[in-house]
Every structure is written in C-alpha cells, then in structure tokens.
C-alpha cells in the first residue's frame, strides 16, 4: 500500500523470514530506519539486517520462525515516522521452492512427487509442455503427489513444479514459490533439453 509516497511490500518466506521492503521516491536519497515488534505492548526494536539499494536502506529481513501473529512496524526518517502499520504476517506467505522432485513413469503417465512442506493449506502445481504445445499445461494437488496422464511416450516433455498458498485460506496477498528447475523427459528417461523443433515420431514396425 502507498503512504506518504511509500510503497510497502511484505513477503513471509516459508514461515521463516519476513522481508519488508519499501520504495519511497520522496526519500530516495535517505537512509530510512525500520523499527518493529511482535507484541503491541513491547518497545520497538530496530532492524539489524537491512537490505540496501544504491547505497540506501530499502528493506529489512527479520527472523520470524513459524509465526502467525501480527508484525507491528514503523519506517522512520530520523525520529519522524514515515509509515506505521501492523500486519498479520501469514497472509504474505511465500512457500519455499519444491525440494527432492522425483518423476515416476508408467507408460503414458508420470507421477511427480516432492517433499511436502511442514505446514498445510498449500497447492503443489506441476506445469509441463512438449515442443508441440503452444502453452504450458498444468495440474495441481493438495500434496506433492501429482499424476499426469495421457502423455505421449515418444514426445519430450519439460516439467517444473511450484507451491502456492490456497487463496481461500491465506487470502489474496500470498506469493507462489519460485519454480523448481526445469527437467526434461522422453521415453521415461531424463534429457538435457527438449528440441525446439519437434522430432518426427519413429515409424511403427509392421508385425
């Protein structure tokens, strides 16, 4: 949101670290300070881990392991508060990128699995395409166990996976995780890449 020309962004990385960044055109050459507390009755602490942009403070990283409570914060120019707010941190969740992604092939289907995150109300999304496809196809499940059927064993497919917070649970302000690395598969075997120009299918041998 904008306040006194200050744009604020909050990201709660995997329920571990909160990043609050600001973009204040009015204070572009100023080292604004960030003060915070997790309890409305406590005194504010000052940030000890600032993010810098062009030599000036532009954000703060806070350790906030598995917290679903309110972050109170004040961005100040000297002693003057430029923006003061409180936010429920969990509504700005960005899950971590999927880890230990595995592919299990069975004929024209593949099951993509990865390590489930320790908290719930997430969607695990697999996107895939072959060079024949004009856009990515997508399938998602509540756990990291996604089976995609109807694939052509002769085609090369690119896959990547990400995690999203359910909007009906966490609201509209979460962020999807970064995508996992793209992996390419053909005939149940991993490939370095899928050729941009589709290779013609091998001729079927007559019996």
């Amino acid at each position: 949101g904008a306040a006194e020309g200050v744009q604020i962004q909050i990201i709660y990385f995997n329920l571990e670290t909160v990043q609050v960044t600001w973009n204040a055109s009015k204070y572009s050459r100023t080292n604004l300070t960030f003060h915070y507390r997790f309890n409305g009755d406590e005194a504010y602490d000052q940030c000890t881990n600032y993010l810098l942009q062009e030599g000036h403070t532009s954000g703060c990283l806070l350790d906030a392991e598995q917290r679903d409570d309110i972050l109170y914060f004040s961005i100040r120019n000297g002693t003057h508060p430029v923006f003061t707010a409180s936010r429920w941190m969990v509504y700005y969740l960005k899950p971590s990128s999927p880890k230990h992604v595995r592919f299990s092939w069975h004929q024209d289907a593949v099951t993509v699995t990865c390590s489930d995150l320790s908290y719930g109300d997430l969607l695990y999304e697999v996107q895939y395409r072959s060079p024949f496809d004009t856009e990515w196809q997508s399938k998602q499940e509540n756990t990291c166990n996604v089976t995609i059927e109807g694939l052509d064993a002769e085609k090369c497919y690119s896959f990547w996976v990400r995690v999203k917070a359910m909007e009906d649970v966490y609201g509209p302000d979460t962020y999807p995780s970064d995508w996992s690395e793209v992996t390419c598969w053909q005939r149940g075997e991993i490939r370095d890449a899928c050729a941009e120009t589709p290779t013609p299918p091998k001729p079927k041998l007559s019996k």
Partner: antibody
Framework: EVQLLESGGGLVQPGGSLRLSCAAS????????MHWVRQAPGKGLKWVSS????????YYADSVKGRFTISRDNPKNTLYLQMNSLRAEDTAVYYC???????????WGQGTLVTVSS | DIQMTQSPSSLSASVGDRVTITCRAS??????LAWFQQKPGKAPKSLIY???SLQSGVPSKFSGSGSGTDFTLTISSLQPEDFATYYC?????????FGQGTKVEIK
Amino acid sequence: EVQLLESGGGLVQPGGSLRLSCAASGFTFRSSAMHWVRQAPGKGLKWVSSVSGSGAGTYYADSVKGRFTISRDNPKNTLYLQMNSLRAEDTAVYYCVKEGGSRGFDYWGQGTLVTVSS
Amino acid sequence: DIQMTQSPSSLSASVGDRVTITCRASQDISNYLAWFQQKPGKAPKSLIYTASSLQSGVPSKFSGSGSGTDFTLTISSLQPEDFATYYCQQYNLYPPTFGQGTKVEIK
C-alpha cells in the same frame, strides 16, 4: 459457505462472568485469525479482541485487557471469549468475525447479546 | 489509537439518488480501509476492502476511493434495500478502529 454462530450471551450481574462461543464452518478455521467486535445498544462498532490462527497471538482493546480472554479450539472449529469482572459498560451485542488478510473483517456472525445489570 | 471520523452522521435521500459518505483517518492508513453496511437488528456486512475493492457478491453500485487519510463510499443509485447505517474501519494499524457510522434514511 462461511458461517459463524455465536452463543453464550445472556443477563449477568456486575462482577460476574460469561463465556461466549462461536462455532465456525465453511472455511479453514485453523489458519484464520479471528476477532470479537461489540456494539452497545444504539451505538457504533468497537473492536474487542483478536487471536491468530494457532492461538499463539492474542490482542485486546485496553478497555477489556486483564478481564477478557480470547481463545480457540481448532479441532472443534470454535472461538471463545471468556469475560470476567463484567461491568455495565460491557453490555453489547458481541460479534464473532473472520479475518481475511487484506480483505479485512470479511465475515461476521449474527451476534449474541450480553447484558450486565443488577 | 487512530480516530476515524465519518460525515455526515446521517443523511436523507431518495431512491435513485447518488450518495457519497466520507471518512477521515487521524493519520495515514495507506489503503487499509473497509466499509460495512448494517441494517437494524442485523450483523454488519463487509462491502469494500483496501479502500476500493468490492467484497465477493457485493453489487457494483457500491464503490470506494481514497488513500492516506481521506476516503469515500459512493452508492451510485440508491435502492430501498440500501437504507442502512454505514461504517468505515481502518485496519492498517492495531487496534482496528471504526467510524461512528452514517445513517442513510429515506427522504
């Protein structure tokens, strides 16, 4: 469909206690912060208390701090407000409210009336 | 605490009228402002959040605007079901606080 159903209101003498309940359904209760808001007869709305999804974070208006306790039982999808040392000025309809992040106080229960009088 | 001041406190209008209610915050609240409608004997209903976003299922005759300290709620064409009390609320900074309400009555 989100539903919030308050109960436990009634007539109580000054200094007495009351426990309000709010049965929630239609959403993932354990992940949602929840609130109590009250409205004295013929008056406006006043925030009373909030609790985080896990129940670890609790917040109170100065007027009720030390007398009221907010809590939740996530397996039972129920929110509570324990009200002690009640005063005449606590007389109000008490609403249970769901937090929606930037969507604010997005769903409200129908309310339960608490009357503190001798 | 942040004070929220609504004006007017009451107004009389006719069906079909365009109605505007204003809300002023005692300090900058960005766009973390909500509007609620309350009918007699009923619970408040959320109409608008983050100053201008319509809650799901709310008709487009309701609109909100503003940022910082000054906000407005507009009902483009008042209908019989819109006669009610309207409250603004800031939720930028705890504790959340409400305006005193604006009662919209039939002229």
